[in-house]
């Protein structure tokens, strides 16, 4: 599916970081940049905790939820993303241990993952997914610009 390659859930690790139109690393959703976000994927990432004041973080979560809805609406890979996020929430266990008989993605679609940590994981998963999508789009534009300049 488009832009989904290179991601794995949970602990999604986009192969490429997100960059803005100016070539600089994109800021965090609330305007603060996670330390190390601009470093190449091959370099050790000194990504610190993205702590921020409560109000700003809540706003960021609202933006993420809205972004999540838009991604599902707009991407042709919406259904695939939904299943990825479900797996991200479910810790990538295919049924796990003990009384985990059903696949976690099914339990998620049944609305069982309603606790705050599951919601938090989903938000982090979407955040990293969007960063990867934006990063790939930008890099594609840069590649195309390079081709045009070379042609001229």
């Amino acid at each position: 599916s488009p832009a989904a390659a290179g991601l794995r859930f949970p602990g999604i690790r986009p192969e490429e970081e997100a960059y803005g139109e100016d070539g600089n690393p994109l800021p965090d959703f609330d305007g603060s940049e996670p330390p190390g976000a601009g470093s190449p994927a091959s370099a050790p990432r000194a990504a610190a905790a993205w702590y921020r004041p409560a109000g700003r973080r809540d706003v960021a979560h609202g933006i993420l939820n809205e972004a999540y809805r838009k991604v599902l609406d707009q991407l042709s890979a919406g259904k695939h993303l939904q299943s990825l996020v479900a797996r991200g929430v479910g810790g990538s266990l295919g049924g796990g241990a003990g009384d985990d008989a059903e696949p976690l993605s099914k339990r998620h679609s049944d609305g069982i993952f309603t606790d705050s940590y599951s919601r938090y994981r989903k938000q982090m998963a979407v955040k990293k997914y969007l960063a990867a999508v934006l990063g790939k789009r930008y890099k594609q534009r840069v590649k195309n610009k390079g081709r045009r300049i070379a042609y001229l």
Partner: antibody
Framework: QEQLVESGGGLVQPEGSLTLTCTAS?????????MCWVRQAPGKGLEWIGC????????TYFASWAKGRFTISKTSSTTVTLQMTSLTAADTATYFC??????????????WGQGTLVTVSS | AAVLTQTPSPVSAAVGGTVTINCQAS??????LAWYQQKPGQPPKLLIY???TLASGVPSRFSGSGSGTQFTLTISGVQCDDAATYYC????????????FGGGTEVVVK
């Protein structure tokens, strides 16, 4: 500077109860702040007890062995408590308070207190 | 419940050498793994989270890799200050969210 300070440790009788307090300074709990308790018996490894979403929902998460005997509560925007009942000598340990690292998908504790020692003995 | 097994312990290393510590989970935990360093009388210090992301302020000689059930912490160019006990910590779902620590690996620097 962000810090966590545990208090309330000390000597307690077997079958007794004790409440430990974790006080945050330099910050107050906000959305997706998971405050957790981890213990370490003398000369042994780390053992997770449980966590609470101290920022919003109050949802709690416990190790299987801790369910029922341990309770984690948020008592203010800067304090969480760990209530322990039916204590035995096996509960003798240093009890650490820790905060989950925001931005990590997994539970990962980026800020720790210095710990408070609980000794269960008659 | 997931069990995390660390090997080997203790590990001996020469200054400037490389140390590799393994952590095996009894069930797949994706990338849900963190690594800590602990010195006597101190609380643990987070080194790596989400299996391979370096925590803030941690020297780049520390690196983490792996996913699923097999994980590795590598210390390249070992320094005297790296003498400590190292713990892995995995998060998993089993009718609820849990996290568990490995038994620890002591690193001795010669």
């Amino acid at each position: 500077q962000e810090q966590l300070v545990e208090s309330g440790g000390g000597l307690v009788q077997p079958e007794g109860s004790l409440t430990l307090t974790c006080t945050a300074s330099g910050f107050s709990f906000s959305s997706s702040d998971y405050m957790c308790w981890v213990r370490q018996a003398p000369g042994k490894g780390l053992e997770w007890i449980g966590c609470i979403d101290a920022g919003s929902s109050g949802d709690t998460y416990f190790a299987s062995w801790a369910k029922g005997r341990f309770t984690i509560s948020k008592t203010s925007s800067t304090t969480v408590t760990l209530q322990m009942t039916s204590l035995t000598a096996a509960d003798t340990a240093t009890y650490f308070c820790a905060r989950h690292l925001y931005g990590s998908i997994t539970f990962a504790f980026g800020l720790w207190g210095q710990g408070t020692l609980v000794t269960v003995s008659s | 419940a997931a069990v995390l097994t660390q090997t080997p312990s203790p590990v001996s290393a020469a200054v400037g050498g490389t140390v590799t510590i393994n952590c095996q989970a009894s069930q797949s935990i994706g990338s849900d793994l963190a690594w800590y360093q602990q010195k006597p009388g101190q609380p643990p210090k987070l080194l790596i989270y989400d299996a391979s992301t370096l925590a803030s302020g941690v020297p780049s000689r520390f690196s983490g890799s792996g996913s699923g059930t097999q994980f590795t912490l590598t210390i390249s160019g070992v320094q005297c200050d790296d003498a400590a006990t190292y713990y892995c910590q995995g998060t998993y779902y089993s009718s609820g969210w849990y996290t568990a620590f490995g038994g620890g690996t002591e690193v001795v620097v010669k």
